[in-house]
């Protein structure tokens, strides 16, 4: 099966969710672990991240499909401070599979308003920070 | 544990520079933006500035901008804040602070260091 | 620059009494985090995001609030919450400021 990993973003008021989806098949989740990285290009590990999830394998789910896992990191208000590039990475213990996904950044601009960068292109987002609202 | 600790406070002359440290342990600090925080004597608290967890991007607050400089070293675990120009009202107990990541507050701050300026 | 204005700027009460901080701010501001000091030692967040408690914090208190008005409660005031407590937001591009502080004593 194939294993990977997508980055997206979304906006609720002056929330910013940064979301790493991790796609996997039921009997692999175990042992994997699902990590958000900051201006971090060679060393993205569980150590360095801002924040990881380790995955457990889910007996109330039937059958052998394709599942996901997603790890959430929520920025209140973003400020100057957040401004970088991140990267949503996993790893396996058990198989030794490491996946890494794309770039993406965020830009926090002189207006006061943030721009979200490098996810697909639907996921180009632009927020006004004072009204909270995607532009 | 979080630990912050201060240090190179102490008697400085108006005009005259200083430069504190604080030693940060208990945390990947590479990850996290710093600040600087002061408290006047029996006052209250004062943002002073602020800096990304990268080191590029620093942020002062108008009354000590061209005058004190934030920085860090992220292989030491350390930030520092160069103090040049001071004046009396910058007598204060300068506090290192961590910023949350995920929020606007700042959650470790230092035992703090004093610092006066007087003739 | 935003400012914060809190009230009253000292106040004392008694065990077990109902206490209301209020910080009010300037011009609108998304959230209001709140600070506890007690003389000799370092701020300890309280109160971040409104209304989340600070780990270790007592259940006795409380935040609320939205735009300008934000307040900081505990509900049966003890002893140890005797304090100096301020509250703080961020904004741009004036970034971080707090409120004067309210030194609350005990009776």
């Known amino acids: 099966g194939c294993i990977n990993i997508t980055s997206s973003a979304s906006q609720e008021g002056t929330r910013l969710n940064l979301i790493c989806t991790v796609w996997h098949k039921k009997e692999e989740a175990e042992g994997f672990v699902v990590f958000l990285c900051k201006d971090r290009s060679g060393d993205c590990s569980p150590e360095t991240s801002l924040k990881q999830l380790r995955l457990k394998r889910d007996p109330g789910i039937d059958g052998v499909g394709e599942i996901s896992s997603q790890l959430m990191f929520t920025i209140s208000q973003v400020t100057p401070l957040h401004s970088g590039t991140y990267q949503c990475c996993a790893r396996s213990q058990k198989s030794g599979i490491r996946l890494q996904g794309h770039f993406f950044s965020i830009l926090f601009t002189e207006t006061g308003n943030y721009t979200v960068t490098g996810l697909k292109q639907r996921q180009h987002l632009e927020f006004s920070h004072n009204e909270g609202t995607l532009s | 544990e979080v630990k912050l600790v201060e240090s190179g406070g102490g008697l400085v002359q108006p005009g005259r520079s200083l430069k504190l440290s604080c030693a940060a342990s208990?945390?990947?600090?590479?990850?996290?933006?710093m600040a600087w925080v002061r408290q006047a004597p029996t006052k209250g608290l004062e943002w002073v500035a602020s800096i990304h967890s990268g080191g590029g991007n620093t942020y002062y607050r108008d009354s000590v901008k061209g005058r004190f400089t934030i920085s860090r070293d992220n292989a030491k675990n350390t930030q520092y804040l160069q103090m040049d120009s001071l004046r009396s009202e910058d007598t204060a107990t300068y506090y290192c602070v961590t910023h949350n990541y995920e929020s606007t507050v700042f959650d470790y701050w230092g035992q703090g260091a004093m610092v006066t300026v007087s003739s | 620059e935003i400012v914060l204005t809190q009230s009253p700027t000292t106040m004392t009460a008694s065990p077990g009494e109902k206490v209301t901080i209020t910080c009010r701010a300037s011009?609108?501001?998304?959230?209001m985090h709140w600070y506890q000091q007690k003389p000799g030692a370092s701020p300890k967040p309280w109160i971040y995001e409104t209304s989340k408690l600070a780990s270790g914090v007592p259940d006795r208190f409380s935040g609320s609030g939205s735009g300008t008005s934000y307040s900081l409660t505990i509900n049966n005031m003890e002893a140890e919450d005797a304090a100096t407590y301020y509250c703080q937001q961020w904004n741009y591009p004036s970034m971080y400021t707090f409120g004067a502080g309210t030194k609350l004593e005990i009776k």
């Open positions: 208990g945390f990947t600090f590479s990850n996290y933006a």
């Open positions: 011009s609108s501001v998304s959230y």
